[in-house]
Every structure is written in C-alpha cells, then in structure tokens.
C-alpha cells in the first residue's frame, strides 16, 4: 500500500501515524496548493487543525480581507490559518469546531459545535454552526444564525457602525455581537471594561478581554 504524502487536515496526519503536536503542511482540497498549520495531537484524542490562536498579543489581528483570506502569523504562536482554506476544507466534509479559552484568573473553558463550516468568499465566508455544548456558556457567543465575516476594509456586518474598525480585528460580527476572539490583546489587570478586547460574552461577560484562545476543527467522524 502506497503511503499518503499529502494531507488535507490534521486528522489525516494523525491517522497516518504522526501523532506529535506541531507544524505540518496541509494541501488544499482538489489542489496542490499548500498551507502550514499547527496540529494539536493531544487534546481530546488529537487530530485537531488549529485555525486560530491567541496567547500574548505578539501578532496584530487588525488585518485586511486578503490577509484573513490567506492567513497570517506563525503556526507556532499567534495566527489565523486562512478563511479560504477553512471554507474549502469544511465544505467537503462535516467538521466540528472546538474553541478553547483561558482567562487571567487561571480558568479554562471550551465551546464545542458539532457542525461547523464557512461559506465561500462570494458569501463573505459566512459562518454556520449547530449543536453547541461545553463549559463556555449555554448560549452561543457567536451570533446565530451565523454572520458574514468582516474586516477593516470589508464591512459586512449588521451594524450602523463598522464593527471591525470599532472593535478591531476580523470576525463574524453581528451588530456587533457577543464575541470577538480577534480583538485587541490586553495584558493582565488592563483587561476589563474593554470595548475592543478578546470577548466571549457567555463565559466571561461584557468587557472582559481573554488571556488565550484557540479555535480548532476536526472531522465529525474522527
């Protein structure tokens, strides 16, 4: 049997026998285009493709539509994998989304959606989510039904304002909504009463800017 040499996600890498967390090269579906991603092979059975990570404010998340489309940052640290890759990947098979959160008091929580996909660029990478469970709130902090993605140079929200400019970062803003994991990073003791921080309302409430966040996806049938 010939060994698989290209992988579409971290679940395929895990199943191939590579079970150490780290940076791996993934290939776009139906293409030879490649992208580097961080694979978490430890959390909940492994096989997770990390699509977003925040931990220290070292990367500027107030980026353009093109940058959010293609991805930015470093997979070893803070980064955004890229809307186009995630859209193509989640359009092919059913994926789950796990969001891991850390606050400044040493607490951790997560939200798990049992079906996640992004529409294509023609639909502004609109987010689709169902089946919320987890410890980071019984109500989804990503507005339902899902919103279009907005950035500082592409305003697709439902607000009379421009949410991405007002709150900072690209996100699936509503008007503007109960979350923004791509907001401005604030250090400890400067992280409350923030209008533009890293927000997950149904866990930490209003104005609380989180310490760390990770968004990761895995096939539902893993």
């Amino acid at each position: 049997k010939e060994e698989q040499t290209t992988f579409r996600d971290c679940a395929e890498i895990f199943k191939s026998g590579l079970t150490t967390s780290g940076i791996y090269t993934l290939t776009f579906p139906n293409s030879t285009e490649e992208i580097k991603a961080y694979c978490d092979m430890d959390v909940g059975g492994g096989g997770w493709t990390v699509i977003q990570h925040r931990e220290d404010g070292s990367v500027d998340f107030q980026r353009t539509w093109k940058e959010y489309k293609e991805g930015f940052g470093s997979p070893l640290g803070e980064y955004w994998l890229g809307n186009e890759f995630v859209s193509q990947l989640t359009g092919q098979h059913r994926y789950v989304l796990k969001i891991q959160l850390k606050d400044w008091e040493g607490n951790e929580a997560h939200s798990l959606y049992d079906h996640f996909y992004l529409a294509g660029e023609e639909s502004n990478y609109r987010i689709h989510l169902t089946g919320l469970t987890g410890t980071a709130g019984k109500i989804s902090s990503i507005s339902q039904p899902g919103s279009d993605f907005s950035t500082k140079d592409s305003d697709n929200d439902k607000c009379i304002c421009k949410c991405s400019q007002m709150l900072s970062g690209g996100w699936w803003f509503d008007a503007c909504g109960p979350s923004n994991l791509n907001g401005q990073y604030y250090p400890q003791k400067q992280n409350t009463n923030k209008f533009n921080g890293i927000k997950w309302y149904y866990w930490k409430g209003s104005g609380y800017s989180l310490k760390a966040t990770t968004m990761m996806i895995r096939p539902a049938d893993f």
Partner: nanobody
Framework: EVQLVESGGGLVQPGGSLRLSCAAS????????IGWFRQAPGKEREGVSA????????YYADSVKGRFTISSDNSKNTVYLQMNSLRPEDTAVYYC??????????????????????WGQGTLVTVSS
C-alpha cells in the same frame, strides 16, 4: 482607563425618591450610550433606562415608565437616574454601563445587554418601610 462610578443609593420608604449618579471617566459621553441596569437577589440583570447624549434619545423599561427619569450632564460627564414613587420591587443593586453609541443594529433603537462593555460596581437601592 474607562471607569464608571455609581452613587446615590440607599434606604428609602415606599413612595420616596432617590437620584442615582453615574460618573464616567476615560471617555466622553458624546460618543456613548449609558444604560442603567438593576439586579435583585436571585434574579437576572435587567435594563431600566438608557440615554444617548448626542441625540438626546432615551429608553425606559415598562416597569419604570412615568416614575424614573434619565438625564445627562456632559460637562460633568455624568448621567443621572431620578427615581420617584419607589416601590419595594425596585429594590436591587443598580449599575450603569456604557456602549459606543454607534454599535447599533440597523432598524433598532437600543442595545442588547452584551454590547455594554464597561460597567460600574453598582449601588444598592433598598425600598422598605
């Protein structure tokens, strides 16, 4: 640093009056809406009243209409809640909170609770004989 400080709470008899103050610092009221919220023991936090200083628009919950009046003094960067004809069911901790005035859904007049990102520590109002 954004700060909101409430004052003016206390013990008052039914039918009495109180005036709460919300002093804001770190931002100017012109660009923000200020809401008053209250939370009674064992109950959810609820919106009482709100004001957009720039346009002078005000909002009142049905339970306080005709009894409470919200106003602002932009020169003092302070918002007031005048509470008349107080009832025992008005007993609660009262909070003021701020939201950028523009953070408003098309076609809507006021803001959901989760849009208010800056909060004060609260002031206790007790209505009892």
């Amino acid at each position: 640093e954004v700060q909101l400080v409430e004052s003016g709470g206390g013990l008052v008899q039914p039918g009495g009056s109180l005036r709460l103050s919300c002093a804001a610092s770190g931002f100017t009221l012109d660009d923000y809406a200020i809401g008053w919220f209250r939370q009674a023991p064992g109950k959810e936090r609820e919106g009482v009243s709100a004001i957009r200083s720039s346009g002078g628009s005000t909002y009142y919950a049905d339970s306080v209409k005709g009894r409470f009046t919200i106003s602002s003094d932009n020169s003092k960067n302070t918002v007031y809640l005048q509470m008349n004809s107080l009832r025992p069911e008005d007993t609660a901790v009262y909070y003021c909170a701020a939201v950028p005035a523009g953070r408003l859904r098309f076609g809507e007049q006021w803001y959901p609770l989760y849009e208010y990102d800056a909060w004060g520590q609260g002031t206790l109002v007790t209505v009892s004989s």
